[in-house]
């Protein structure tokens, strides 16, 4: 015999108290699949979390972080504070990048400058706490009479993939 609950669509639950008829999920709850015997409580985006997508009867709310924070974990389970470019977040808070390292993001740790000489190139623009070194042509190409090199446009800030 087929389970009568299997006919209950998403957004409803199979109500044992009412002869296993399909009842709509109560307010602030949802069921994302059919055949559920209960509805799940909607996630509430409070504090540093803000609502990215409202809860519906068939899908949970989705949260992201208020400005000055960024998401960590599947479904943005945690908000972590941003730092400024040129800094990294340590367990003791935001700290400036050490000499020879940089961070062009508001999150993550400071990255060592590119060592241009490893690819046989020269330094065209020095690095800073916020920006990597820009490598130019190889030193041999910079002999007297060689044409001048136009520095490239500033690097586009790399994107953040959703976690």
């Amino acid at each position: 015999l087929q389970d009568p609950c299997s006919n209950c669509p998403a957004g409803t639950f199979c109500d044992n108290n009412r002869n296993q008829i399909c009842s709509p999920c109560p307010p602030n709850s949802f069921s994302s699949a059919g055949g559920q015997r209960t509805c799940d409580i909607c996630r509430q985006c409070k504090g540093v979390f803000r609502t990215r997508k409202e809860c519906s009867s068939t899908s949970n709310a989705e949260c992201d972080c208020t400005p000055g924070f960024h998401c960590l974990g599947a479904g943005c389970s945690m908000c972590e504070q941003d730092c400024k470019q040129g800094q990294e977040l340590t367990k003791k808070g935001c700290k400036d990048c050490c000499f020879g390292t940089f961070n062009d993001q508001k999150r993550g740790i400071c990255r060592p400058w590119t060592n241009c000489s490893l690819d046989g190139k020269s330094v065209l623009v020095n690095g800073t706490k916020e920006r990597d070194v820009v490598c130019g042509p190889s030193p041999a190409d910079l002999s007297p009479g060689a044409s001048s090199v136009t520095p490239p446009a500033p690097a586009r800030e790399p994107g953040h993939s959703p976690q």
């Epitope: 960590l72 990294e88 340590t90 367990k91 990048c97 050490c98 020879g100 390292t101 961070n103 993001q105 999150r107 993550g108 740790i109 400071c110 990255r111 060592p112 400058w113 590119t114 060592n115 490893l118 690819d119 990597d132 070194v133 820009v134 490598c135 490239p152 690097a155 586009r156 800030e157 790399p158 994107g159 953040h160 993939s161 976690q163």
Partner: antibody, heavy 120, light 108 residues
Framework: QVQLVQSGAEVKKPGASVKVSCKAS????????MHWVRQAPGQGLEWMGW????????NYAQKFQGRVTMTRDTSISTAYMELSRLRSDDTAVYYC?????????????WGQGTLVTVSS | YVLTQPPSVSVAPGETARITCGGD??????VHWYQKKPDQAPVLVVY???YRPSGIPERISGSNSGNTATLTLSRVEAGDEADYYC????????????FGGGTQLIIL
């Protein structure tokens, strides 16, 4: 969806060079650093270096400096890793892997791997 | 910087496996964990000490303090049998990327 597709297996003689490619799709290639990691038979994972596909800037593990060159072709969203003066202990599976947009997090997408066999 | 892992950890199905990763003041670093099965690419299972990427089950968790980071797999299944690697990034230019030696998880 994000995909990293690597070139096929290679067999090389000691002293030769090998160039492995990694074609990216499903995201902005220039926005994310690419790393190379290898695993020799019966050994663990070993980080080799990274390239910033936007600027071409690189950083190599000290062990590989002077033998490895990482390049990219932004027009075809492809990163390359060339290893020269190959030795038998360079026999390994070589992986490209994407950094998720900032330094200090885990490598979130990986290529399928390229087996490089160095044998006389 | 050196990361030390036990070569293997054995556990019965349904039990909890704990894989450790030791390093000097590793608690000050962000530790990532990868699962590696034969003939497959590594998969990121925990990043920045304790965060799971989408699609990784909640029974996998991580922690990090002092000189030891730990990957915990609860209610272990046969499909969890794999090698697990911890990894950190340094700001040092000599060797920014460091992996532990790996731990083989054996399901009894």
């Amino acid at each position: 969806q994000v995909q990293l597709v690597q070139s096929g297996a290679e067999v090389k003689k000691p002293g030769a060079s090998v160039k492995v490619s990694c074609k990216a799709s499903g995201y902005s290639f220039t926005g994310y650093y690419m790393h190379w990691v290898r695993q020799a038979p019966g050994q663990g994972l070993e980080w080799m270096g990274w390239i910033n596909p936007n600027s071409g800037g690189t950083n190599y593990a000290q062990k590989f400096q002077g033998r490895v060159t990482m390049t990219r072709d932004t027009s075809i969203s492809t990163a390359y890793m060339e290893l020269s003066r190959l030795r038998s202990d360079d026999t390994a599976v070589y992986y490209c892997a994407r950094e998720p947009g900032y330094y200090g997090s885990g490598l979130d997408y990986w290529g399928q791997g390229t087996l490089v066999t160095v044998s006389s | 910087y050196v990361l030390t892992q036990p070569p293997s950890v054995s556990v019965a199905p349904g039990e909890t496996a704990r894989i450790t990763c030791g390093g000097d003041d590793i608690g000050d670093k962000r530790v990532h964990w990868y699962q590696k099965k034969p003939d497959q690419a590594p998969v990121l299972v925990v990043y920045e000490d304790r965060y799971r990427p989408s699609g990784i089950p909640e029974r996998i968790s991580g922690s990090n303090s002092g000189n030891t980071a730990t990957l915990t797999l609860s209610r272990v299944e046969a499909g969890d049998e794999a090698d697990y690697y911890c990894q950190v990034w340094n700001s040092s230019s000599d060797h920014p990327g460091v992996f532990g030696g790996g731990t083989q998880l054996i399901i009894l």
